[in-house]
């Protein structure tokens, strides 16, 4: 059986280095694929009800996710 | 919006083996995390594991290699063979796609597998 | 494994209630200041929804009765006035760690 890539990280890996235009971070393998590959967030409507999700750097900081809310390039998710 | 949709299921014997399958439609399963979750009657939740858009495939290791995930992108569909069946694994099994965050916010109906002689 | 319980495994309540169900991990699953905990309603016979993920993120289409907090071990999904559809089994579920675990659930019922 395959084990998953987050077997082979420790607690404390070092965040990636963020991702070039075009490409988004995945959560999961902790690397940069292209943006097509992931179901990157869409933004919320304005006025929406639901509080905007949290993300751990300001949006100035997240880099390549193309329109609305931005992939996060960081190691952290699954 | 994503659509699952899953079939396969039934009644098989101890030690036979089956294969289920979950069609999606609204987005290619070229693209995020697709899983596969079960519960048993009257009981919780467990995750089974998942197939990617590479088509890199993780498992719950409770499952002991006996469970193989595998899809067909021509047919948007992926699948979960499972073999060396036991009593235990009668439940609903579940397709479910993940959002970015993780969290799994498409489900399908849900198909049931019996493992009886 | 991160073991996940929930309290109470059930409990009576009726429309209009403040419901406050807790989810304990048996380690933490924040890292880099994320929490991975989310939450799922499910109705008997039916398919889990999602409700809250990331702790406290409110899925889309979720009312805003339903809210989550917490952080590293100890998480609520706090429903604000319960109302008669939301009589259902609530389960909570970490992707911090593989595998990925669940809470084993809290059905909440009609007093």
């Known amino acids: 059986m395959r084990r998953g890539p987050r077997s082979l990280r420790g607690r404390d890996a070092p965040a990636p280095t963020p991702c070039v235009p075009a490409e988004c971070f995945d959560l999961l393998v902790r690397h940069c694929v292209a943006c097509g590959l992931l179901r990157t967030p869409r933004p919320k409507p304005a006025g929406a009800s639901s509080p905007a999700p949290r993300t751990a750097l300001q949006p100035q900081e997240s880099v390549g996710a193309g329109a609305g809310e931005a992939a996060l390039p960081l190691p952290g998710l699954l | 919006e994503v659509q699952l949709v899953e079939s396969g299921g039934g009644l098989v014997q101890p030690g036979g083996s089956l294969r289920l399958s979950c069609a999606a439609s609204?987005?290619?399963?070229?693209?995020?995390?697709w899983n596969w979750v079960r519960q048993a009657p009257g009981k919780g939740l467990e995750w089974v594991g998942y197939?990617?858009?590479?088509?890199?495939?993780y498992y719950n290791p409770s499952l002991k290699s006996r469970f193989t995930i595998s899809r067909d992108t021509s047919k948007n569909t992926f699948y979960l063979q499972m073999n060396s069946l036991r009593a235990e694994d009668t439940a609903v099994y579940y397709c479910a796609n993940l959002n970015y965050y993780g969290a799994m916010d498409y489900w399908g109906q849900g198909t049931l597998v019996t493992v009886s002689s | 494994d991160i073991q996940m319980t929930q309290s109470p495994s059930s409990l009576s309540a009726s429309v209009g209630d403040r419901v406050t169900i807790t989810c304990r991990a048996s380690e933490s699953v924040d890292d880099y200041g994320i929490s991975f905990m989310h939450w799922y309603q499910q109705k008997p016979g039916k398919a889990p929804k999602l409700l809250i993920y990331?702790?406290?993120d409110l899925e889309s289409g979720v009312p805003s009765r339903f809210s989550g907090s917490g952080s590293g071990t100890d998480f609520t999904l706090t429903i604000s006035s319960l109302q008669p559809e939301d009589f259902a089994t609530y389960y909570c579920?970490?992707?911090?760690?593989?595998?990925?675990?669940f809470g084993q659930g809290t059905k909440v019922e009609i007093k």
């Open positions: 579920q970490q992707t911090s760690k593989d595998p990925w675990t």
């Open positions: 990331r702790a406290s």
């Open positions: 197939i990617n858009y590479s088509g890199t495939t």
């Open positions: 609204g987005d290619s399963i070229t693209r995020g995390y």
